[in-house]
Interface confidence: low
């Protein structure tokens, strides 16, 4: 089964090659809207130094395999090379959100991207009713990514002094109220991203319409609107809307909950101070440590490494997990030196899968939580690749 492009087509996505000072605009179904790339460009690359933009992938020259999309062009790689054409290759992996296209590398001929997204999953378990892009680049080309805040079920309760109402929101997607562990959101209308509970009734006060926007280097904004349908009586004829402003704090701090800063005629303004609004390089590294210079905090997990010894064992319900944290690749898990996490099915010990690899390691410290992520594991039945936190 190929990638579900419909979910990605509604938006023009952005990726950045910061080393070469280039911005890519990506619309997997066609027009990225930049004139010099032409009307059928699916991937347009803009050189920030020269302000020149050129197409590196044409929507009319698209070919696809199950998890790979290739966009060719009619342009030769170099003036002297008329044989090979410039092309873009996007590898899709199943993810829990729409995700973001990540620039991997570029050669003279091929621009490579990787995209972990629900659009690539075999099963619909993570698919949202409505989801919008949840990241933005600042003018230093640093990525601000709120995808980790997206809830797959339920919502966030907004801190509000009104005892008669409770406002719940999700980030960049609708609230999946049916899968909410607490039953109170089950009454929320399907598709709402902002649900107001008043008495025993629930009102849809906003749905995601467009992606996350950057206001300044430390402020991001998301707007939910309710355009169709009848307006609740208490809105005094106004259409409900919710504006959520995410603020990167000026120094490291624990996480806070979203706070209602203003409301009038069903227009709700919410401010959320969260380190996820800061640029991603401030929050994470690909090693097992974070430094005071870059991350404003010093953390080193390398003492947890099991050099030459046995891995940590974690007992799950169906699986036993073997974990080699920040480890020495001489410790072979799943008979594979690349494996950082390995899972073995309890009912059948021959069923062994890599659940994360050393080369796909991310250490993240945000809102007081320290998370070590190993991705790039073997494929699951959902199409999802194993991914260990």
């Amino acid at each position: 089964q190929a990638v579900d492009l419909d979910a990605l087509c509604s938006y023009t996505w952005e990726a950045v090659d910061s080393k070469n000072n280039a911005v890519y605009k990506i619309n997997v179904c066609g027009n990225v809207g930049i004139s010099s790339c032409g009307p059928t460009s699916a991937i347009c690359m803009c050189d920030l130094k020269t302000e020149n933009c050129r197409s590196v992938g044409d929507s009319l020259l698209r070919s696809s395999a199950r998890s790979l999309l290739e966009f060719n062009t009619t342009m030769g790689c170099q003036p002297s090379d008329s044989q090979h054409r410039i092309q873009t290759s996007i590898t899709f992996l199943c993810g829990k959100t729409l995700g973001t296209p990540e620039f991997v590398t570029a050669t003279d001929c091929v621009h490579y991207f990787e995209w972990r997204t629900t659009a690539a999953c075999k099963k619909d378990i993570f698919k949202a009713d409505k989801e919008v892009p949840c990241y933005a680049f600042d003018d230093k080309l640093q990525k601000h990514d709120l995808n980790p805040l997206i809830k797959l079920n339920g919502g966030y309760l907004v801190d509000d002094s009104d005892p008669d109402t409770s406002l719940f929101i999700n980030v960049c997607r609708d609230i999946d109220s049916l899968r909410d562990p607490s039953t109170q959101l089950r009454v929320c209308p399907a598709g709402t991203a902002a649900c107001l509970l008043k008495g025993n009734q629930a009102f849809d006060v906003g749905r995601p319409k467009e992606g996350l926007k950057l206001l300044s280097k430390d402020r991001l904004v998301l707007t939910y609107v309710k355009e169709e349908g009848e307006k609740p009586d208490f809105c005094n004829g106004h259409s409900p809307a919710v504006t959520v402003t995410f603020v990167c704090p000026s120094e490291r701090r624990e996480g806070t909950i979203p706070k209602l800063t203003a409301k009038s005629n069903c227009r709700y303004e919410v401010e959320w101070i969260t380190e996820y609004a800061c640029h991603r390089d401030y929050l994470q590294s690909e090693s097992c440590s974070l430094s005071s210079e870059q991350h404003d905090i010093t953390i080193d997990l390398s003492p947890l490494a099991q050099y030459g010894g046995s891995p940590y064992v974690s007992d799950g319900r169906e699986y036993t997990f073997f974990i080699n944290v920040c480890g020495d690749t001489k410790v072979s898990l799943c008979n594979n030196k690349e494996a950082a996490v390995c899972q073995e099915k309890k009912a059948d010990s021959t069923q062994v899968k890599i659940a994360g690899r050393h080369q796909n390691q991310t250490l993240r410290y945000s809102d007081g939580d320290l998370t070590l992520i190993y991705s790039g594991g073997d494929e699951c039945s959902s199409g999802h690749h194993h991914h260990h936190h």
């Epitope: 911005v23 010099s36 302000e51 933009c53 003018d139």
Partner: nanobody, 124 residues
Framework: QVQLQESGGGLVQAGDSLKLSCTAS????????GGWFRQVPGKEREFVAS????????YYTDSVKGRFTVSRDNAKNTMYLQMNSLKPEDTGVYYC?????????????????WGQGTQVTVSS
């Protein structure tokens, strides 16, 4: 230092057209990226369109693609926004902006100079 002044706003019916102008004073206009933004009361200013210093490359937000055209005449130190098939949701104060640093027009933040704004109202 670049000073910007918008003109051409007004009240029109849905479906009508309007052309906004932005005149710049200062010798460097031909070297800088130009942009148009709009704002409705109670909302943040939002990006509409931008044009590179040469005028070769233009970029539009999704909601105006195919309806709005940005252009510039460097000899006259002027940038334009031709708005066709206007909708009530296009109502707002339109600002022209300019950016001296040579960043991509695809980046919609980081503008250094701003005009005072001109009101566009589209009635249904």
């Amino acid at each position: 230092q670049v000073q910007l002044q918008e003109s051409g706003g007004g009240l029109v019916q849905a479906g009508d057209s309007l052309k906004l102008s932005c005149t710049a004073s200062g010798p460097t206009f031909s070297e800088i990226t130009g942009g148009w933004f709009r704002q409705v009361p109670g909302k943040e200013r939002e990006f509409v369109a931008s044009i590179s210093s040469t005028g070769i490359t233009t970029y539009y937000t999704d909601s105006v693609k195919g309806r709005f055209t940005v252009s510039r005449d460097n000899a006259k130190n002027t940038m334009y926004l031709q708005m066709n098939s206007l909708k009530p949701e296009d109502t707002g104060v339109y600002y022209c902006a300019a950016r001296s640093t040579s960043r991509s027009i695809a980046i919609t933040v980081g503008y250094d100079y701003w005009g005072q704004g001109t009101q566009v109202t589209v009635s249904s």
